[in-house]
């Protein structure tokens, strides 16, 4: 004879376990239904009645099958230096990641707690190591024969142009100036701009515009200024 299908709640076999999407209720000593994502246990099961589930209340969520009495609260709204890459719904928490030009200075389990602006290398310095989602730009002084005349978080040191006749010699922050004959370069400059760090998560590059009558979707976290590294600017 085929084994009978047990309907929750039911007493498990001695030493047995409850099935998938069920849990063992210590008080009732029965196998009872879990609640699906987006819901929570409103009434726990008894020996004769199963778990009663209810939808998560506004701004709360459950991501897994569960029997929690209350859903978890979503995280705070994303700050203005962040992009909401996942909205708060009944089934998932909000995820905030840093917007382009910023990196995550303090991460959390998912997304970022605190973003900081990428360091900009001042003239005479170029990007030695580009910023990533979780690390700042590293600047280095331009070596002899190279220069950077910008304040940028992406520009590297470029080679001076080579002149047949030099009008003004180049230095770390200025290109050489040639007389009217056409100049050449000491080497191919390659990509002058390093790309912004690319997020592994798909990002909306622009948050939804906030209504004029209403709450924008963002606010600015007080990010304390970090001491500028050599060759960096606080801008």
């Amino acid at each position: 004879l085929p084994a009978q299908v047990a309907f929750t709640p039911y007493a498990p076999e001695p030493g047995g376990t409850c099935r998938l999407r069920e849990y063992y209720d210590q008080t009732a000593q029965m196998c009872c239904s879990k609640c699906p994502p987006g819901q929570h246990a409103k009434v726990f099961c008894t020996k004769t009645s199963d778990t009663v589930c209810d939808s998560c209340e506004d701004s709360t969520y459950t991501q897994l099958w569960n029997w929690v009495p209350e859903c978890l609260s979503c995280g705070s709204r994303c700050s203005s230096d962040q992009v909401e890459t996942q909205a708060c719904t009944r089934e998932q928490n909000r995820i905030c990641t840093c917007r382009p030009g910023w990196y995550c200075a303090l991460s959390k389990q998912e997304g970022c707690r605190l973003c900081a602006q990428l360091r900009k290398c001042r003239p005479g310095f170029g990007v030695a190591r580009p910023g990533t989602e979780t690390s700042d730009v590293v600047c280095k002084p331009c070596a002899p024969g190279t220069f950077s005349n910008t304040t940028s978080s992406t520009d590297i040191c470029r080679p001076h142009q080579i002149c047949h006749v030099v009008a003004i010699p180049g230095n770390a922050s200025m290109d050489a100036v040639c007389t009217s004959t056409s100049p050449t370069r000491s080497m191919a400059p390659g990509a002058v701009h390093l790309p912004q760090p690319v997020s592994t998560r798909s990002q909306h590059t622009q948050p939804t515009p906030a209504p004029s009558t209403a709450p924008g979707t963002s606010f600015l976290l007080p990010v304390g200024p970090s001491p500028p590294a050599e060759g960096s600017t606080g801008d």
Epitope: S55, D58, S59, S73, S76, A87, C88, R90, R94, P215
Partner: antibody, heavy 120, light 108 residues
Framework: QVQLVQSGAEVKKPGASVKVSCKAS????????MHWVRQAPGQGLEWIGR????????KHDPKFQDRVTMTSDTSTNTVYMELSSLRSEDTAVYYC?????????????WGQGTLVTVSS | DIQMTQSPSSLSASVGDRVTITCTAS???????LHWYQQKPGSSPKLWIY???NLPSGVPSRFSGSGSGTDFTLTISSLQPEDFATYYC?????????FGQGTKVEIK
């Protein structure tokens, strides 16, 4: 752009019912709540209740328990609030307002208000 | 129900003054669930500060909000003519959701 447009002013006799509508445009009714808030002349704001237009689930202040009915028509993006057994103290401007899911109940858009006068 | 009590109920101030309005909850409210609205005569309320301290776009930076637990504050650092209005606090922590009775900011 987001707009909440409410029905016009009403004059009702005590004991009658009134049904106020609020038509939403410029946003998706999914993952938002629509609230009803009233304001008696010269008084403060009083929350009546809210509806999830997608599911029809409602919640209201127990003081309106047996008198308020909130409904939604997703085909026209309109929500309704009906208040029955009207008395003179129900004279107020009735506002609808929306709060997006996940915004912790912040009501970011409000209708223009509907004046309901209860007078014999 | 959570009672929200605002003080003062009304205040008279001059342009340029620093103005502080307080809102006291009868039991603890999570800061994410505390909001402020501005209302001018004959107009609908507008969301003015959300989640205790955050300004919607279009709200001037002279406004700020702070607080936690049962005590919350709205501050105007330098009062401007367009700020004369009534301000309401609102808790969404526990149903039924409630508003303060309002604070009317008038011209001295």
């Amino acid at each position: 752009q987001v707009q909440l447009v409410q029905s016009g002013a009403e004059v009702k006799k005590p004991g009658a019912s009134v049904k106020v509508s609020c038509k939403a445009s410029g946003f998706n009714n999914k993952d938002i709540y629509m609230h009803w808030v009233r304001q008696a002349p010269g008084q403060g704001l009083e929350w009546i209740g809210r509806i999830d237009p997608a599911t029809g689930n409602t919640k209201h202040d127990p003081k309106f328990q047996d008198r308020v009915t909130m409904t939604s028509d997703t085909s026209t993006n309109t929500v309704y609030m009906e208040l029955s057994s009207l008395r003179s103290e129900d004279t107020a401007v009735y506002y609808c307002a929306r709060s997006p899911y996940g915004d912790f109940g912040a009501m970011d858009y409000w209708g223009q208000g509907t004046l309901v006068t209860v007078s014999s | 129900d959570i009672q929200m009590t605002q003080s003062p109920s009304s205040l008279s101030a001059s342009v340029g003054d620093r103005v502080t309005i307080t809102c006291t909850a009868s039991s603890s409210v999570s800061s994410n669930y505390l909001h402020w609205y501005q209302q001018k005569p004959g107009s609908s309320p507008k969301l003015w500060i959300y989640s205790t301290s955050n300004l919607p776009s279009g709200v001037p930076s002279r406004f700020s909000g702070s607080g936690s637990g049962t005590d919350f504050t709205l501050t105007i650092s330098s009062l401007q003519p367009e700020d004369f209005a009534t301000y309401y606090c609102h808790q969404y922590h526990r149903s039924p959701w409630t508003f303060g009775q309002g604070t009317k900011v008038e011209i001295k």
